[in-house]
């Protein structure tokens, strides 16, 4: 649909989902809650010093299938889980860091809880 001028409503409209956000809150978030037409996520990754850092927030519908795909990256330990079944569902997501491995992986499963 067009955004400038004479367009009519798309159907069906997606229902907005509220997610908890931490270290990943957009400028419009209030009380650490963000809104999305896509998924809530929680992610754990290592920072530069090797400490685990947990972030959570909203992923837009566009591209979220790719972002929620837990594809291992060489020399980077990271895990992401996504959900849509209820508002703030990512409060109950607890991804864990994958074990250190030498060989690279090409693809991984989509983690939808």
């Amino acid at each position: 649909k067009k955004e400038d001028g004479e367009s009519t409503a798309p159907t069906p409209r997606p229902k907005i989902l509220r997610c908890k956000c931490h270290h990943h809150c957009p400028e419009d978030s209030v009380n650490n809650i963000c809104s999305t037409d896509g998924y809530c996520f929680t992610m754990i990754e290592e920072d530069d010093s090797g400490m685990p850092v947990v972030t959570s927030g909203c992923l837009g519908l566009e591209g979220s299938d790719f972002q929620c795909r837990d594809t291992p990256i060489p020399h980077q330990r990271r895990s992401i889980e996504c959900c849509t079944e209820r508002n703030e569902c990512n409060k109950d997501l607890h991804p864990t860091l994958p074990p250190l491995k030498n060989r690279d992986f090409v693809d991984g499963p989509i983690h939808h809880k």
């Epitope: 367009s7 069906p12 409209r13 957009p26 809104s35 508002n87």
Partner: antibody, heavy 117, light 113 residues
Framework: QVQLQQPGAELVMPGASVKLSCKAS????????MHWVKQRPGQGLEWIGE????????TYNQKFKDKATLTVDKSSSTAYMQLINLTSEDSAVYYC??????????WGQGTALTVSS | DIVMTQSPSSLAMSVGQKVTMSCKSS????????????LAWYQQKPGQSPKLLVY???TRESGVPDRFIGSGSGTDFTLTISSVQAEDLADYFC?????????FGGGTKLEIK
């Protein structure tokens, strides 16, 4: 067709409580948010809060968090708003309104609440 | 809270004339992730409930006559009625849905001469 049915009027005493209803039909109740909006005579519109009927998740305008409580009955596709400790300032028309995103695509006809002894 | 300011508060126009009314927000309603403005316009005829006219600042709701045109971006928005009709007598409200609490402008009352 989508309909949000509200009682036309309610008269209550100061200090009392009231539970306003909004019966939804013509769509899947749990697929949309339900909001409540206040309009005093000759004044603008004030958003009170929202409820997602699918998981009963609520967000309130801080101004109304001690005044209003939002609930739903999924079996009858009805949303409710309870208002407590009523004063003349609560006399207004109260609308329920549906949203998918956070703009309101269908509105009830409104309930005119009068708080008077 | 985001403050919405509408002007003028009232105006009287003759049938067939072009009408423009303004809505200004105290902060930008443009979301960077999708480049959409989170602003809606409503029409409230005397004794009736509000009716959605426009959302995302410029997308007309289905069934709304094409004489109603929403425009603007960021903090400045306009609702234009290209050729006003007698049945357009109403109050017009803008609403931001960028950040909770969702807030409305004070309204513009359109009278027909």
């Amino acid at each position: 067709q989508v309909q949000l049915q509200q009682p036309g009027a309610e008269l209550v005493m100061p200090g009392a409580s009231v539970k306003l209803s909004c019966k939804a039909s013509g769509y899947t109740f749990t697929n949309y948010w339900m909001h409540w909006v206040k309009q005093r005579p000759g004044q603008g519109l004030e958003w009170i809060g929202e409820i997602d009927p699918s998981d009963v998740y609520t967000t309130y305008n801080q101004k109304f968090k001690d005044k209003a409580t939002l609930t739903v009955d999924k079996s009858s596709s009805t949303a409710y708003m309870q208002l407590i400790n009523l004063t003349s300032e609560d006399s207004a028309v109260y609308y329920c309104a549906r949203s998918g995103w956070d703009y309101f695509d269908y509105w009830g006809q409104g309930t005119a609440l009068t708080v008077s002894s | 809270d985001i403050v919405m300011t509408q002007s003028p508060s009232s105006l009287a126009m003759s049938v067939g004339q072009k009408v423009t009314m303004s809505c200004k927000s105290s902060q930008s309603l443009l979301k960077s992730n999708n480049q959409k403005n989170y602003l809606a316009w409503y029409q409230q005829k005397p004794g009736q409930s509000p009716k959605l006219l426009v959302y995302f600042a410029s997308t007309r709701e289905s069934g709304v006559p094409d004489r109603f045109i929403g425009s603007g971006s960021g903090t400045d928005f306009t609702l234009t009625i290209s050729s006003v009709q007698a049945e357009d007598l109403a109050d017009y409200f803008c609403q931001q849905y960028y950040s909770t609490p969702w807030t409305f402008g004070g309204g513009t009352k359109l009278e027909i001469k």
